[in-house]
């Protein structure tokens, strides 16, 4: 499955939206910094099957969508920008889902290794736990927004490697 060019554009637009969403300076939130143990190894590997890479990308986008579509998120961010973010993420999920169906099932057998997906889930679980502990404060959301940008940046690198493999 070839990811459409629009997927890369959507990814870029998502990064721009996340950047525009910033409400306060990260420098004023230094005391709230947190290491979420981003699973970098899941985004570095050239050892990835294409199916696995697509599934990891899908999981990152799905978890990002879930994170920003909570009640607490809608209070924290500009509604107009959030709506645009949902649209971008939803489109990317659709692009990837079409690919997942083609790549993951070959001859009726699933090729997915769940380990990478679980690493992504544990990472997002730490993010949601952090937000809960910080009572969804503006600084906590700002730290999380910056962290999601970082994870999207790594996702982009994985996408680029996927494109080069095609």
């Amino acid at each position: 499955c070839d990811l459409p060019q629009t997927h890369s554009l959507g990814h870029r637009r998502t990064m721009m939206l996340l950047a525009q969403m910033r409400r306060i300076s990260l420098f004023s939130c230094l005391k709230d910094r947190h290491d979420f143990r981003f699973p970098q190894e899941e985004f570095d590997g050239n050892q990835f099957q294409k199916a696995e890479a697509i599934s990891v990308l899908h999981e990152v986008i799905q978890q990002t969508f879930n994170l920003f579509s909570t009640k607490d998120s809608s209070v924290a961010w500009d509604e107009r920008l959030l709506d645009k973010l949902y649209t971008e993420l939803y489109q990317q999920l659709n692009d990837l889902e079409a690919c997942v169906m083609q790549e993951v099932w070959v001859g009726g057998t699933p090729l997915m290794n769940e380990d990478s997906i679980l690493a992504v889930r544990k990472y997002f679980q730490r993010i949601t736990l952090y937000l809960t502990e910080k009572k969804y404060s503006p600084c906590a959301w700002e730290v999380v927004r910056a962290e999601i940008m970082r994870s999207f940046s790594s996702s982009r690198n994985l996408q680029e490697r996927l494109r080069r493999k095609e």
């Epitope: 143990r37 699973p39 978890q63 769940e114 679980l118 889930r121 679980q125 736990l129 809960t132």
Partner: antibody, heavy 122, light 107 residues
Framework: EVQLVQAGAEVKAPGESLRISCKVS????????ISWVRQIPGKGLEWMVK????????IYNPSFQGHVSISVDKSITTVYLQWSSLQASDTAIYYC???????????????WGQGTLVAVSS | DIQMTQSPSSLSASVGDSVTITCRAS??????FHWYRQKPGKAPELLIY???NLQTGVPSRFTGSGSGTECTLTITSLQPDDFATYYC?????????FGQGTKLDVR
């Protein structure tokens, strides 16, 4: 086949130290949280602590924090629960459990060890 | 901590009967409710996760429902194996907590 195999029963005196183990096999060790659950004989279940074997990130039940510690040895896919000074009230069965984590980030305990009975008595 | 209260605490029934066990949480736990069965002398085993999902290998006689602060476990056509203690659990907030258990015995 997923297996969590726990060490045998232990009889200890108050004040002694103890480390019990849970050897896992049948899946990628670093992919799933592991928890310990206590059951005092004839009583209910209490969650104690969980650990991510990937980087030893831990979350404790405040009721147990400071009294027990959890650790892992990735090289032998084993999780440990340790006491530096046992009390009679630590007498219980201790279960290690594997967590599954759904896409909506719901934890549940999908595989349990057979349990280790710890008896603390003078 | 989120308190989990099961009712009834004990229950008598016969093979072939249907029974329902209820679990109430002291605050909303969404669908982060799970049910376990513990046979005497054995480790607990997962029956239902996320309020209503049947764990692989568990017979369809077990059904779970509910969300928010209340969920129920229903067992239809009781089998001899089902006489055991049942626990609900929440994993919505730390610390994770269990109900006190419901002992199901033979009438």
């Amino acid at each position: 086949e997923v297996q969590l195999v726990q060490a045998g029963a232990e009889v200890k005196a108050p004040g002694e130290s103890l480390r019990i183990s849970c050897k896992v096999s049948g899946y990628t060790f670093t992919s799933y949280w592991i928890s310990w659950v206590r059951q005092i004989p004839g009583k209910g279940l209490e969650w104690m602590v969980k650990i991510d074997p990937r980087d030893s990130y831990t979350i404790y039940n405040p009721s147990f924090q400071g009294h027990v510690s959890i650790s892992v040895d990735k090289s032998i896919t084993t999780v440990y629960l340790q006491w530096s000074s046992l009390q009679a009230s630590d007498t219980a069965i201790y279960y290690c459990v594997r967590h599954y984590l759904t896409q909506s980030l719901v934890d549940y305990f999908d595989h349990w060890g057979q349990g280790t009975l710890v008896a603390v008595s003078s | 901590d989120i308190q989990m209260t099961q009712s009834p605490s004990s229950l008598s029934a016969s093979v072939g009967d249907s029974v329902t066990i209820t679990c109430r949480a002291s605050q909303s736990v969404s669908n982060y409710f799970h049910w376990y069965r513990q046979k005497p002398g054995k480790a607990p085993e997962l029956l239902i996760y996320s309020a209503s999902n049947l764990q692989t290998g568990v017979p369809s006689r077990f059904t779970g429902s509910g969300s928010g602060t209340e969920c129920t476990l229903t067992i239809t056509s009781l089998q001899p194996d089902d006489f055991a203690t049942y626990y609900c659990q929440q994993t919505h907030g730390y610390p994770f907590t269990f109900g006190q258990g419901t002992k199901l015995d033979v009438r």
